[in-house]
Interface confidence: low
Amino acid sequence: NIDVCKLGTVTVQPAPVIPLGSAANISCSLNPKQGCSHYPSSNELILLKFVNDVLVENLHGKKVHDHTGHSSTFQVTNLSLGMTLFVCKLNCSNSQKKPPVPVCGVEISVGVAPEPPQNISCVQEGENGTVACSWNSGKVTYLKTNYTLQLSGPNNLTCQKQCFSDNRQNCNRLDLGINLSPDLAESRFIVRVTAINDLGNSSSLPHTFTFLDIVIPLPPWDIRINFLNASGSRGTLQWEDEGQVVLNQLRYQPLNSTSWNMVNATNAKGKYDLRDLRPFTEYEFQISSKLHLSGGSWSNWSESLRTRTPEEEPVGILDIWYMKQDIDYDRQQISLFWKSLNPSEARGKILHYQVTLQEVTKKTTLQNTTRHTSWTRVIPRTGAWTASVSAANSKGASAPTHINIVDLCGTGLLAPHQVSAKSENMDNILVTWQPPKKADSAVREYIVEWRALQPGSITKFPPHWLRIPPDNMSALISENIKPYICYEIRVHALSESQGGCSSIRGDSKHKAPVSGPHITAITEKKERLFISWTHIPFPEQRGCILHYRIYWKERDSTAQPELCEIQYRRSQNSHPISSLQPRVTYVLWMTAVTAAGESPQGNEREFCPQGKAN
């Protein structure tokens, strides 16, 4: 802190505000009878330079003039933009123990003269708004700079406002607080911005405009939509606008879209009919306004109106599939499945499905409605049956989709050939096949059906399926496909009245199983040993098991074990082996193999055959 300058004064030549690159002389003078008490020649004046309150330089070597013990002049150069503080101190040279005493100080500001303001832009928001102008000030001056905005117009209209820029605030916009009215629509107005600081002044070029050039209408408000006769595709959009508006722009989109539908409307008077809306779809609507067909500016977009269009009756065809299971000699269970319509087809909330099972010749008909996407009935095994399903919302029902109920795997000649299942990535499996070799009738379509091979999956979970055109021989299945799970995949070839199928197992990713099968029993029958086991628990299989291996070796032997490899079948849980010596104790165990490798061994069992040697 600098005390009031009792000891002396500090002055700056040419001025305390200088242009960038200029030098300045700073003089420090002691007042009469001030200084070191012993004798004046011991007075030494020093000048210290501070930037941001940090001492950066002692200017002792920059003395250009010295009246010993009375005054000193220092030249300062290369000052940076902004404020620099200089403090003059008195050092009594014969008293080293006392610190220098502050005499006085001065602040020098370095800056530049203002550039002419450019790019003036004026707007009046709404017919009742006020004129506000903004501009580009150019380079920062580093000095307090005053800006004056002047407007002149017809009938000796003049108006001005001022603001300033410094290191805390920027002045590049002013509101004149006056309103231009539509009756001045053809009149011309001129604005000019003048900038002034301690190093100079400058003026912008005059900027000329008319009422239409600068008035931006207020965005439309009170937006609403009326759907004609509760139509889901036609509606009248209504809004409020300022009185002078002649042109509107409408934009609207479903909320899940990223591109707007754009419409221009001339003299709409706050109303416009839309005819291409999607039923039962959440839309966002916005409107902008303009006061003149060719000139002027568009308003900002209005607040969004978000609303859902009404329902209309469903369109599209349901994707139906079925399963047949014989219950006894004269009855079968038919389970129908179908996929939900997508939103553009459902066109509303599906309330229920109408399901019909009909025996073609005897005209027996079973009908029901359900809210689920499956339906099961027991029907006679005789006769030709057809099923149909339609979806209903509050406005009506879709056209029924028909499917003939045939024996899906009943015709060997229709079975697709060379079915393969190849892992594509973690989430899907590529299934390929060749067409049936000697089909009696033309294949109308292929159905690829898949289901996880886990206990109870047939009863607990509906199947997943894809319909494939008859000229395609591959399908990429991904719905509900998880890694490390084995799926049973069936490819059905369907003709008008017959079906043939081929089955394969596949997985999207596999690892070696976590454990081997558990041997539950070893029994001896007619000189053969039967090994029985329990399958590996489903979560531990980690993909499709290709085969099991049964290993055996004599107890306490160090020789390599013998092994027998068995093709995996879900239904099989025992296998005979016949190459063991009688009255020799063997150790037996099992492993399981996937495409990724072999599991660790399962439990070990000892057994000593009693029968004759082979």
Partner: nanobody
């Protein structure tokens, strides 16, 4: 089943900032619309913001526009709510929600299939 877990709530002074996070348990995260709702005592659950399609589309309630920013990191299965210039009226329990993206009524709580337990945000001096 998708589990959602919010974090980041707390007490903050008016004008302050908080960042809420919501971690989802499943890889199908990117197929969902992820939203934040809030519920003040005695009031209905109110929509705050939603982010869809890996962050390409966002919507905000008018009361938070310009102050709150919603974003998502599909690699981390996480959605964030950056709350700046907080006001006392922002005090509420903030819930994270996820729903299959069908484009209908993103501001309606009933459109969302999965919800977190909520995290308390209190704005008070």
């Amino acid at each position: 089943q998708v589990q959602l877990q919010e974090s980041g709530g707390g007490l903050v002074q008016p004008g302050g900032s908080l960042r809420l996070s919501c971690a989802a348990s499943r890889r199908t995260f990117s197929k969902h619309a992820m939203a934040w709702f809030r519920q003040a005592p005695g009031k209905e659950r109110e929509f705050v913001a939603v982010v869809r399609w890996s962050g390409i589309i966002t919507y905000y309630a008018d009361s938070v526009k310009g102050r709150f920013t919603i974003s998502r990191d599909d690699a981390k299965n996480t959605v964030y709510l950056q709350m700046d210039s907080l006001k006392p009226e922002d005090t509420a329990v903030y819930y994270c929600a996820a729903g299959d993206y069908r484009g209908n009524g993103y501001y309606v709580p009933g459109m969302y299939d999965y919800w977190g337990q909520g995290t308390q945000v209190t704005v008070s001096s």
